[in-house]
Amino acid sequence: MGSAALEILGLVLCLVGWGGLILACGLPMWQVTAFLDHNIVTAQTTWKGLWMSCVVQSTGHMQCKVYDSVLALSTEVQAARALTVGAVLLAFVALFVTLAGAQCTTCVAPGPAKARVALTGGVLYLLCGLLALVPLCWFANIVVREFYDPSVPVSQKYELGAALYIGWAATALLMVGGGLLCCGAWVCTSRPDLSFPVKYSAPRRPTATGDYDKKNYV
């Protein structure tokens, strides 16, 4: 596969991953009420996210409440907010860096410098994925630990929410996409013939038979 194809595929994966990360960040489903026993008579499900918590009644009516005080939030929610927002912003920066280093753009002149810019974009996406992975795994660890902790009240036990799974899928896409961008940039630096167009030499004068020398054509 040519470096341009790697670049395009990598960028598409990164953009989808970025969208997924934004979705995960905003969804109030980082943890959801766990129904362990049928004898808990409850008519509602609680969802908790980074920015709000929602109560879903059995009737389908949903009521969400945005967290009032930042200081009142637990450490992991504050850290998760900072890291996921940081990852989203880093992906935004990575997008411009990647576009600048892309073969189809003229922001940077073709050559090793352009390949290095593209490589930087790929690395930034990889970092973005790692950055987003930290709060997702930290949060998941707390939810799982408390689920199995016998000291935690039954009604206060939660399960992993959809936002965490979306987040993990997004980080996977960001890291795979970033890896492909890095591979594409690496191909450019190590095999320039695979990346930039061949510079054709001017055709020689016609031979006696009137044919052009075909070796100039690929």
Epitope: D37, H38, N39, I40, V41, T75, E146, P150, S151, V152
Partner: antibody, heavy 117, light 112 residues
């Protein structure tokens, strides 16, 4: 030997505040949920509040929700109960308890809080 | 909230006899997840703090004499004291440790 020693009780007027403390020893404080349980004179036991290991999660009984705040200082192995807007019905002996597996396995000697004008 | 109802409220006893007291919960305290019954029994002697005797319906705490026996189903529980001793005179409370708010029964008082 597990020891829980409460302090800070006394006579207080309705509407005023009081802060109870509980000094713990004989076990690794940060390894346990802790709780406050109270007992009104000649009455039964009532769970007041619980707090998780590092204080991340707190739970309250309906009668004290919004008025009482449970907290802990693991460095000092001390449990606290900040009581605000006290009412006559808050008059009770307050027990500091160790709280594993949602039951109360060790209890302090208790501290009396009297809310009266 | 889970309501705990204890009976009888008081009981006249004699040394050496077998004493039985009951505790009923308004909903099942049995967890299908870990196959446990979340009920505890406490003993409170006059002028003293409560003392945990039994947790998980039947598990005796260390140091508790084996004459104290806890049993029961999901909603109906029993504390039996075999060979009643004078030092066992106290108020006995049951508590559901299934979920918040944790609730206690009103107590059963043992009197001579």
């Amino acid at each position: 030997e597990v020891q829980l020693v409460e302090s800070g009780g006394g006579l207080v007027q309705p509407g005023r505040s009081l802060k109870l403390s509980c000094a713990a020893s004989g076990f690794t404080f940060s390894d346990y949920y802790m709780a406050w349980v109270r007992q009104a004179p000649k009455k039964g036991l009532e769970w007041v509040a619980s707090i998780s290991y590092e204080g991340r999660n707190t739970y309250y009984g309906d009668s004290v929700k919004g008025r009482f705040t449970i907290s802990r200082d693991n460095a000092k192995s001390t449990l606290y109960l900040q009581m605000k807007s006290l009412r006559s019905e808050d008059t009770a002996t307050y027990y500091c308890t160790r709280h594993p597996r949602r039951y109360f396995d060790y209890w302090g000697q208790g501290v009396m809080v009297t809310v009266s004008s | 909230d889970i309501v705990m109802t204890q009976s009888p409220s008081s009981l006249a006893v004699s040394a050496g006899e077998t004493v039985t007291m009951n505790c009923r919960s308004s909903q099942s305290l049995f967890s299908s997840g870990d196959q446990k019954k979340f009920l505890a029994w406490y003993q409170q002697k006059p002028g003293q703090s409560p003392k945990l005797l039994i947790s998980l319906a039947s598990t005796r705490e260390s140091g508790v004499p084996d004459r104290f026996i806890g049993s029961g189903s999901g909603t109906d529980f029993t504390l039996t004291i075999n060979n009643m001793q004078a030092e066992d005179l106290a108020i006995y409370y049951c508590q559901q440790h299934y979920d918040i708010p944790y609730t206690f029964g009103a107590g059963t008082k043992l009197e001579l």
